[in-house]
Amino acid sequence: DTHKSEVAHRFKDLGEEHFKGLVLVAFSQYLQQCPFEEHVKLVNEVTEFAKTCVADESAENCDKSLHTLFGDKLCTVATLRETYGEMADCCAKQEPERNECFLQHKDDNPNLPPLVRPEVDVMCTAFHDNEATFLKKYLYEVARRHPYFYAPELLFFAARYKAAFAECCQAADKAACLLPKLDELRDEGKASSAKQRLKCASLQKFGDRAFKAWAVARLSQKFPKAEFAEVSKLVTDLTKVHTECCHGDLLECADDRADLAKYMCENQDSISSKLKECCDKPLLEKSHCLAEVENDEMPADLPSLAADYVESKDVCKNYAEAKDVFLGMFLYEYARRHPDYSVMLLLRLAKAYEATLEKCCAAADPHECYAKVFDEFQPLVEEPQNLVKQNCELFEQLGEYKFQNALLVRYTKKVPQVSTPTLVEVSRNLGKVGAKCCKLPEAKRMPCAEDYLSVVLNRLCVLHEKTPVSEKVTKCCTESLVNRRPCFSALELDEAYVPKAFNAETFTFHADMCTLSEKEKQVKKQTALVELVKHKPKATKEQLKGVMDNFAAFVEKCCKADDKEACFAEEGPKFVAASQAALA
C-alpha cells in the first residue's frame, strides 16, 4: 500500500487537526528544550508543506519520507548546538541513522521546571482568548516532559482538557468544577506516560518478541473467548502501532491505531462481548476505551491444559515444528484461564515451560522428564502472591505515607548509590500500589499490583540508565524483563556500600517548611529519611521510626511557634544531635 507522497497520505487520513497535533508532539518530544513558539512555527511550516502535497503529490520533495522531512525541519533550528550539544551531530547523519540518533537523545528526566498551575480565572481567560494556542501549549508542555508519551492518547487527553475548560469556565464555581478534573488528568497522564514507557523499553531493550509475548498474555486475559488466531492478529497489529510510536513515527502510529480500533469494532463477535459501548464513541475516545476495556468472561467449558501441554506424547513434536507458535498458544491458553495472574507471572510461567521443553525434549524419555512441569510453576505463583499479601498487610497497618516510608528505607538499603530524588520518586510511586490495588478483591490484586510495580521499576531502570551508579540496579534492569520485580525484591542490604558522611546542611530545616503543601512536606521528610539511611544503612526500622516521629513532632512544634525561624534554628540542632545519638 505505497503512496506517492507519504506526508499527503497521512494528512488526508488523519485530518488537519490531528496531523498538526501529532507533529507538534513529535517535535516537542525530540527537541525538549525548544520554546513553544519555535515549535509552533515548525509545525505550521510542515503543515503548509503537507497541504501543497495533498494538492499535488508530485510536487517537489513530496516523495520524501516523513523522517527525512521532519529531520530536515528539526535541523533548521538555529540554536541546536548551543541548546542540545552533541545532539546537533545527529544532523550530519543520513536517514535512518539520523532518526535513531534523535531517539537516543530523548531525555527521560529533562531539566525543566515543574508545571505551575495558574489561578483558575487566569487559565479561563487564556482558554477563551485563544483556545487553539492554549491546547497546543498543553500538548507541548506534556510532550516535552514525557518524550515517550503515547501520542494518539495524548490527543485524547488534550480533548478532555479542552472539555474540562469549556464546561468549567462557564460554571458558577469555576475552581470547584475545574481543579478536580485537572488533578485527575494530571494523575492519569503520569500513569499513562509510565505505562507507555515500559512498552517502549520492552520493544527497544528486549525486542519485539518480548513485547509480543506481553501482548499475547494481556490480550488473552482481556479476550478469553477469542480464538488464538484472532489474538495473534491483534498482537501483530498492536506491536506495529507501538513500535511506530516508540520509534517516533507518530503519524503512522496514530493512523494504524485508528485502523486497529476500526477492525476491532467490525469484528466484535470474534473478539469480546465488552467492546459494544466503546465502539459507539468518537475515534480518540473509542481507542482509549478499547485499550482500557475490562476482561470478558471466561468461556465456561475450558478443558484442562495438561492434556495438550503435559500428557500428550506429541508435546516435543509440536514444539519442534514451530517453537514460538507452540509457546504462544501455551501462553494464550494459560492467560485466558488466569485473569487472576499478573502478566509478568504468566510470562515467567511460559519461560519456565520453554526451559523445561528445551531440556526435556533432548532427554532420553522426554515425557517422563516434563511430566511434572506444572508442579514447578507452584513456587513461581506463590512468590508474587506472598509479596502482595505481605505488602498489603503492611499498607493496611501503616497507611500510604508511612508505607511509602517503609519502601524508602527498603530500597535505600538495597541500592543506596541511587540518587536521593530518584529513590524518593520511585518509592513514593511504589507506595501508591497500596491504595490502588490492596482494596481490590483477591482475584484482581496480583495483576493490579505486580503489573503496576513493573511500570514503576521501569522508571527506576530508565533513570538509572541515564546515570548508572549501581551494578545491582543494572543487573536487575537488563538481565530479564519479566524477572525485574523479583530481582529487586530479592536484593538484600548492600554490604559493600560505604555509608555517606554526615552533612549537617542536609538535615537543616527552615520556616519555609511550614508553608509547603502536605505533599511537598512529605517529600522533604522523605528526602531526609533517605539521607539518614544513606548515612546509617544498618539502622533498624524501630530506630528510624523513632527518628521520623521526632522529626514530625519537631516540625509541628516549630510551625506552631510565633517565631518559626528562631524555633527551627534552636530546635533543629537538638533534633539532629538526638537523632545521631539514637542511631549510634
Epitope: 506472598n386 505481605q390 498487610e393 503492611l394 527498603r410 530479592a490 542490604l493 526500622k541 521510626k545
Partner: nanobody
Framework: QVQLVESGGGLVQPGGSLRLSCAAS????????MGWFRQPPGKEREFVAS????????YYADSVKGRFTISRDNAKNTGYLQMSSLKPEDTAVYYC?????????????????WGRGTQVTVSS
C-alpha cells in the same frame, strides 16, 4: 530491645528430625514477626521460614516446604522451627530474627533483632 536466644540444634542423621526454639525477652513478643534464617558453611545467609505476629500467616523457602514447620507461642514468648526429613544440605547455623513490622518478610535486612545462632549438622 529484644533479646533472642536459639536452642535445640545438634547433630542428626539424614532423614531425622530436630526442633529449634527461639526464646524472646525484653519487649512484647506478640508485636513482632519471627523469622528463621540459616547460613550454610561458606555460603550467604538465606531465608528459611517466617511467621507473622498473630501466627496466622507462615512463609517457607522452596527448599524446606513440606519438611519444616514454623510456629509460635506468644504466651511463652517463644518461636519454634520443627525440622523433619533432614538432608545433609540443611547443615548450617540457624538464626532466629524478629521483625517489628509484624509481617514476616523474606529479606534478612527487614529484621531488627537477631539471635546468635544454633548449629545444625546433618550427617551420617
Amino acid at each position: 530491645q529484644v533479646q533472642l536466644v536459639e536452642s535445640g540444634g545438634g547433630l542428626v542423621q539424614p532423614g531425622g528430625s530436630l526442633r529449634l526454639s527461639c526464646a524472646a525477652s525484653g519487649r512484647i513478643f506478640s508485636t513482632y514477626a519471627m523469622g528463621w534464617f540459616r547460613q550454610p558453611p561458606g555460603k550467604e545467609r538465606e531465608f528459611v521460614a517466617s511467621i507473622n505476629r498473630s501466627g496466622d500467616s507462615t512463609y517457607y523457602a522452596d527448599s524446606v516446604k513440606g519438611r519444616f514447620t514454623i510456629s509460635r507461642d506468644n504466651a511463652k514468648n517463644t518461636g519454634y522451627l520443627q525440622m523433619s526429613s533432614l538432608k545433609p544440605e540443611d547443615t548450617a547455623v540457624y538464626y532466629c530474627a524478629a521483625d517489628s513490622d509484624g509481617i514476616g518478610w523474606f529479606n534478612s535486612f527487614e529484621y531488627d533483632y537477631w539471635g546468635r545462632g544454633t548449629q545444625v549438622t546433618v550427617s551420617s
